[in-house]
């Protein structure tokens, strides 16, 4: 347990006095927090946190889902933790299959273990397929497996967390990695026609095509020197992964002389912006 100088508040003391505890499924979890200023126990795992205001945390029949970090906090805001593994041969992994990765960033496959003494904790491809050669990962039994520097090529990769138990490979449920691409260029914008000459009362319709790596690209039609919101209609397509196209069509059903002017199709992403213009001249 931590030691501090006399007079200073000290962290609570937990019994049993170890950082990790392994119990068998069905057995009792009994944790005692000793501190004159005891406030609460907090339990954290995957999708939840629970609190307990009793200084003794007792779970009579432990389940795999009781695996997690138990933290005791005192009135000074100081805390101490113990991590409990509830060993259940039938449930080696706790999983949350939501798996998103931002290109070039790390992402966590959430499959913490209920038994830290299994071996070869790693990732495997689905249906026996190998993982991409450049995929690097770091396993952490208490959190899951961190995929380092996600690549665009990993999009929709199917994988399992895997361990060896008694010489056999055990797989978790399937995870599907969804990669959000990093914008590495401005959107590509083009317009159906650069200029229009119309008579009064004729319909003005112009289409802007926006191409980018994802549907997160923003686009809008603007009239130069005007804040008025223009009415536009969208059609969009994914031409395979990371090849997104949107068509934004601006229509004025009955053009008037004062509709004449420059209309700009503007698009932006986190990398930058692009625009293209078309000129409308309406004569009476």
């Amino acid at each position: 347990q931590p030691s501090v100088s006399p007079g200073e508040p000290s962290p609570p003391s937990i019994h049993p006095g170890k950082s990790d505890l392994i119990v068998r499924v069905g057995d009792e979890i009994r944790l005692l927090c000793t501190d004159p200023g005891f406030v609460k126990w907090t339990f954290e795992i995957l999708d939840e946190t629970n609190e307990n205001k009793q200084n003794e945390w007792i779970t009579e029949k432990a389940e795999a889902t009781n695996t997690g970090k138990y933290t005791c906090t005192n009135k000074h805001g100081l805390s101490n933790s113990i991590y409990v593994f509830v060993r259940d041969p039938a449930k080696l992994f706790l999983v949350d299959r939501s798996l998103y990765g931002k290109e070039d960033n790390d992402t966590l496959v959430r499959c913490p273990l209920t038994d830290p003494e299994v071996t070869n904790y790693s990732l495997k491809g689905c249906q026996g397929k190998p993982l991409p050669k450049d995929l690097r990962f770091i396993p952490d039994p208490k959190a899951g497996i961190m995929i380092k520097s996600v690549k665009r090529a990993y999009h929709r990769l199917c994988l399992h967390c895997s361990v060896d138990q008694e010489g056999e490979s055990v797989l978790s449920e399937k995870f599907i990695l969804k990669v959000r691409p990093a914008f590495k260029a401005v959107p590509v914008v083009s317009v159906s026609k650069a200029s229009y000459l119309l008579r009064e009362g004729e319909e003005f319709t112009v289409t802007c095509t926006i191409k980018d790596v994802s549907s997160s690209v923003y686009s809008t039609w603007k009239r130069e020197n005007s804040q008025t919101k223009l009415q536009e209609k969208y059609n969009s397509w994914h031409h395979g992964d990371f090849n997104y196209e949107r068509q934004a069509t601006l229509t004025i059903s009955s053009a008037r002389v004062n509709d004449s002017g420059v209309f700009m199709c503007y698009a932006n992403n986190t990398f930058g912006s692009a625009n293209v213009t078309t000129t409308l001249e309406v004569v009476d």
Epitope: L46, D47, S98, K102, C158, K174
Partner: antibody, heavy 117, light 111 residues
């Protein structure tokens, strides 16, 4: 127990903006994506967008891009959605929903936004 | 965008009988055998409540009277037997692809 607390109602004037909150408790806020959904009698349920856990990245439905802005305050475990340039078409119930194990497992009670002069 | 079409828009089912609601997607919502399709129940004045996830998995705490089936583009929610408390609107939702989309809803009335 997981809870998402939203204010019951907001009355706002046309042209103004509104920032609604979604206070999360009962789980580690920074570990889960928070989605926002709009519900109107005419359009049904519409996904507005998501703020991703950890880094605060966002992804929007194009229909709401430029209209809605999603943010989060980790210190108070609160997600926010701001809607600007309000019109009568923005009158709706807005829900926050936590994504858990691929699905929207927890929903707030919703904030009724009424746009009226 | 993936369009989800629910049918029927409304149905009335007698107590104790079976209710079947269909949801058709404009394109597949499957990846490697996982169908990213979910079903929600909504009662007036309440938020949607998750019933079925990944097409056929029963959410914890939801009665076994509710079941889901289907893959790729065609999905079904079945309630058997129907109880009085099941009167509500039911929505399908896909999160295979941005933007996530919901079906138009099916209003279930109990006779």
């Amino acid at each position: 127990q997981v809870q998402l607390q939203q204010p019951g109602a907001e009355l706002v004037k046309p042209g103004a903006s509104v920032k609604m909150s979604c206070k999360a408790s009962g789980y580690t806020f920074t570990s889960y994506n928070m989605h926002w959904v709009k519900q109107t009698p005419g359009q049904g349920l519409e996904w507005i967008g998501v703020i991703y856990s950890g880094n605060g990245d966002t992804s929007y439905n194009q229909k709401f891009k430029g209209k809605a802005t999603l943010t989060a305050d980790k210190s108070s475990s609160t997600a926010y959605m701001q809607i600007n340039s309000l019109t009568s078409e923005d009158s709706a119930v807005y829900y926050c929903a936590r994504e858990r194990d691929t699905r929207f497992g927890n929903w707030g009670q919703g904030t009724l936004v009424t746009v009226s002069a | 965008n993936i369009v989800l079409t629910q049918s029927p828009a409304s149905l009335a089912v007698s107590l104790g009988l079976r209710a079947t609601i269909s949801c058709r997607a404009s394109e597949s919502v499957d990846i490697y055998g996982n169908s990213f399709m979910h079903w929600y129940q909504q009662k007036p004045g309440q938020p949607p409540k998750l019933l079925i996830y990944l097409a056929s998995n029963l959410e914890s705490g939801v009665p076994a009277r509710f079941s889901g089936s289907g893959s790729r583009t065609d999905f079904t929610l079945t309630i058997d037997p129907v109880e009085a408390d099941d009167a509500a609107t039911y929505y399908c939702q896909q999160n295979n692809e941005d933007p996530y989309t919901f079906g138009g809803g099916t209003k279930l009335e109990i006779k």
